[in-house]
């Protein structure tokens, strides 16, 4: 019931999934900054943001899932359900279907929630723009 | 859309045991929880316990540990619960619910239709 | 076990006024910063329907004639203006610790 997995997709395949995704990420982003206000910019997580399996730049779906997936209960779960729908159309190996863990301080809770979606956001217009650019050697991001 | 479909109405004996089923669609099934909860007549909700289709990892309620066996099949994307040693005191609309995604319990959101379980001889 | 008491066990509320419905937990329900109660309708012969999740989150595709307030032991789900099609049992349920528990309900019926 879900698409080809993420080696068979086209960068047309890519491009319509980010374009799907990027809206959901932004206002996911902005609707928690309104939320948190005066919370700094974080570098508490390093969200994966590319894949080296492919040619392509490919955004890493089976590393980004599980951290939408830990993240679901502490925002909103009905954009966090699309984009678990639209990331497990990007994956390449087999996930590790283990749930993850949060960490336990709110502050600590925060920061990872806002680098979580800072980082999506920032791994998604890359990946765009890389995708705009044309075929090119691209370096991929871990 | 997300839809859980479950199986009909059991009409069993006593002692017997019966597998129940929760068939899910619209979504990535191994991701969600799937819990079960049980409705006895003219009363209110009780949880009887969860399973995590992803690794198969499940939480019962105590009350209903040695009477509920839930399992998952993820190639239909198919939820059962299995009830064994029934009663009278089992009779009762069964529900499954979808839970969350993570280790962090949260709402059912979706829930299916319910099977009726009578238990008669 | 967290146990929930809801109260009024009924409610009669004419056509067009608010109803208020009352959940209090025997212990916080609070964890992350958030609380994690919600509430459910339930009408005769169907199952229960989300209408608010994490205290005061209301459902995609949930009139916003309900909400939820409330945190970490006493929560509060509001019906204003209630309409015909309310008529139901409304429960509470907590997912902050195992065993998941859920309130006796309330009936909600119209005056």
């Known amino acids: 019931s879900h698409m080809a997995p993420a080696h068979r997709l086209q960068p047309s395949d890519i491009r319509k999934i980010i374009l799907e995704l990027r809206p959901m990420s932004k206002g996911l982003l902005q609707d928690y900054l309104k939320k948190e206000i005066g919370l700094p910019e974080s570098n508490h997580s390093s969200l994966p943001c590319l894949s080296s399996d492919s040619q392509l730049p490919h955004i890493n779906g089976s590393a980004i899932l599980p951290y939408f997936r830990a993240i679901r209960p502490l925002s909103d779960k009905n954009t966090i359900d699309k984009i678990i729908e639209q990331l497990d159309k990007l994956k390449f190996q087999r996930e590790p279907e283990a749930k993850v863990s949060m960490a336990a301080a709110n502050f600590e809770r925060k920061n990872f929630i806002l680098a979580v979606l800072q980082q999506f956001s920032a791994c998604l217009e890359h990946v765009l723009q890389s995708l705009n650019s044309g075929p090119q050697h691209h370096h991929h991001h871990h | 859309q997300v839809q859980l479909q479950q199986s009909g109405a059991e009409l069993v004996k006593p002692g017997a045991s019966v597998k129940l089923s929760c068939k899910a669609s619209g979504y990535t099934f191994k991701y969600y929880d799937i819990n079960w909860v049980r409705q006895r007549p003219e009363q209110g909700l009780e949880w009887i316990g969860w399973i995590f289709p992803g690794d198969g990892g499940t939480k019962y309620n105590e009350t209903f540990k040695g009477k509920a066996t839930l399992t998952t099949d993820k190639s239909s994307s198919t939820a059962y619960m299995q009830l064994s040693r029934l009663t009278s005191e089992d009779s009762a609309v069964y529900f499954c619910?979808?839970?969350?995604?993570?280790?962090?319990?949260?709402?059912?959101?979706?829930w299916g239709q319910g099977t009726s379980v009578t238990v008669s001889s | 076990d967290i146990v929930l008491t809801q109260s009024p066990a009924s409610l009669a509320v004419s056509l067009g006024q608010r109803a208020t419905i009352s959940c209090r937990a025997s212990?916080?329900?609070?964890?992350?910063?958030?609380?994690?109660m919600h509430w459910y309708q339930q009408k005769p012969g169907q199952p229960p329907k989300l209408l608010i999740y994490?205290?005061?989150n209301l459902e995609s595709g949930i009139p916003a004639r309900f909400s939820g307030s409330g945190s970490r032991t006493d929560f509060t789900l509001t019906i204003n203006p209630v309409e015909t099609d309310d008529v139901a049992t409304y429960y509470c349920?907590?997912?902050?610790?195992?065993?998941?528990?859920f309130g006796a309900g309330t009936k909600l019926e119209l005056k």
């Open positions: 994490r205290a005061s």
């Open positions: 349920q907590q997912s902050n610790k195992d065993p998941l528990t």
């Open positions: 212990e916080s329900v609070d964890n992350y910063g958030i609380s994690f």
């Open positions: 619910a979808r839970g969350g995604t993570s280790v962090i319990r949260d709402a059912m959101d979706y």
